[in-house]
Amino acid sequence: SAGAGSHCQKTSLRVNFEDIGWDSWIIAPKEYEAYECKGGCFFPLADDVTPTKHAIVQTLVHLKFPTKVGKACCVPTKLSPISVLYKDDMGVPTLKYHYEGMSVAECGCR
Amino acid sequence: SAGAGSHCQKTSLRVNFEDIGWDSWIIAPKEYEAYECKGGCFFPLADDVTPTKHAIVQTLVHLKFPTKVGKACCVPTKLSPISVLYKDDMGVPTLKYHYEGMSVAECGCR
């Protein structure tokens, strides 16, 4: 798995809805693959972390003044939906095919 | 200033182009306000950090398993352009009114 010394990358993160208290309204799935963005944004920032100009600038400033300015951060830059079966206001089980922004599609340095 | 104990917010970051080696092609300005996103993404994530569903989920998982999963990260969620004077291929000083993605407009938890 990607630790602090690894470069920014997408890693597995299985989320159980019971663990986060969402099982009260999400019927299924019981768990899903959320993924997590882990690792550092080290100089030089590679193309695969799709850095913004600001991230590049911040990385260069961090290189010059490491105690003054932090590195850019490895975060989700593109998210994907999942499908969930949930209870609506009337308690009726309803399928939402695209519950947006739940799973990481891509990670990058921001 | 926003430290590790502060909530995610936009803070000042003056960047001198000479410090990052960009003075070789950016003639002016000599420095600019880039801003930096600093502070933590603590539970519960406030509306002003515009959290994605994934950031909310990750925050809840971190609450349950703090050693296994990291907090969401405070990063630029909206960037602004700056204007720069640079030399083109012929060495002609040219103004780029909108050099995109250089300054933080908004920070959020991702």
């Epitope: - | 002016a28 204007s83 012929m90």
Partner: antibody, heavy 119, light 111 residues
Framework: EVQLVESRGGLVQPGGSMRLSCAAS????????MNWVRQAPGKGLEWVAH??????????HYAESVRGRFTISRDDSKSSVYLQMNSLKTEDTGIYYC??????????WGQGTLVTVSS | DIVLTQSPDSLAVSLGERATINCRAS??????????MNWFQQKPGQPPKLLIY???NQGSGVPDRFSGSGSGTDFTLTISPMQAEDVAMYFC?????????FGQGTKLEIK
């Protein structure tokens, strides 16, 4: 080597017309704003007009003193810029310089051509 | 329009000495942290030549004895040490807004 060569000017009567042309070489003409700047005898410099790029829809701007009388145009395929001068006045007399540059500066200058408006 | 006023109108400087030409704008020519001020040199019978751009940057091939400073409304062109080939007219010029305007010029001569 960058070169801007203006056409020969000349003598024209007040109220008359003249067309100046300027042929450019040594740079990518279509990438640069083109301008005309003039200098009355023994006097200072006055910007007359400019024409921007194709991406700017060849936008033109004129000094108040010539607006409505002068027209600037360009032909990128010929690397040339033109100044059509109508209803000429004695105060239009001077050396007319063709200049190329950016949205910030006059970078390239021709040697200039003398236009004399006199009866 | 932005009016540029140069001082002095003419200046005589000994060879090896310092020549200072000032240019004052009727309003600030700074924007975005950039000074929209340039300086041109014109020798008799020649077109103007770009000396200094963005207030303080030397044009291509311009000798180090030419320097520019200033911001906002007040700008200075300095020539040091003065050399015989520096005899010319000097013009400041702003490109902050159309119409781009020039100062009236300063004639530099040898004392």
């Amino acid at each position: 080597e960058v070169q801007l060569v203006e056409s020969r000017g000349g003598l024209v009567q007040p109220g008359g017309s003249m067309r100046l042309s300027c042929a450019a070489s040594g740079f990518t003409f279509s990438n640069y704003w083109m301008n005309w700047v003039r200098q009355a005898p023994g006097k200072g410099l006055e910007w007359v007009a400019h024409i921007r790029l194709k991406s700017d829809n060849y936008a033109t701007h004129y000094a108040e003193s010539v607006r409505g009388r002068f027209t600037i145009s360009r032909d990128d395929s010929k690397s040339s810029v033109y100044l059509q001068m109508n209803s000429l006045k004695t105060e239009d007399t001077g050396i007319y310089y063709c200049t190329g540059g950016s949205n910030y500066v006059f970078a390239f200058w021709g040697q200039g051509t003398l236009v004399t408006v006199s009866s | 329009d932005i009016v540029l006023t140069q001082s002095p109108d003419s200046l005589a400087v000994s060879l090896g000495e310092r020549a200072t030409i000032n240019c004052r704008a009727s309003e600030s020519v700074d924007n975005y942290g950039i000074s929209f001020m340039n300086w041109f040199q014109q020798k008799p019978g020649q077109p103007p030549k770009l000396l200094i751009y963005a207030a303080s940057n030397q044009g291509s091939g311009v000798p180090d004895r030419f320097s520019g400073s200033g911001s906002g409304t007040d700008f200075t062109l300095t020539i040091s040490p003065m050399q015989a080939e520096d005899v010319a007219m000097y013009f400041c010029q702003q490109s902050k807004e159309v119409p781009w305007t020039f100062g009236q010029g300063t004639k530099l001569e040898i004392k």
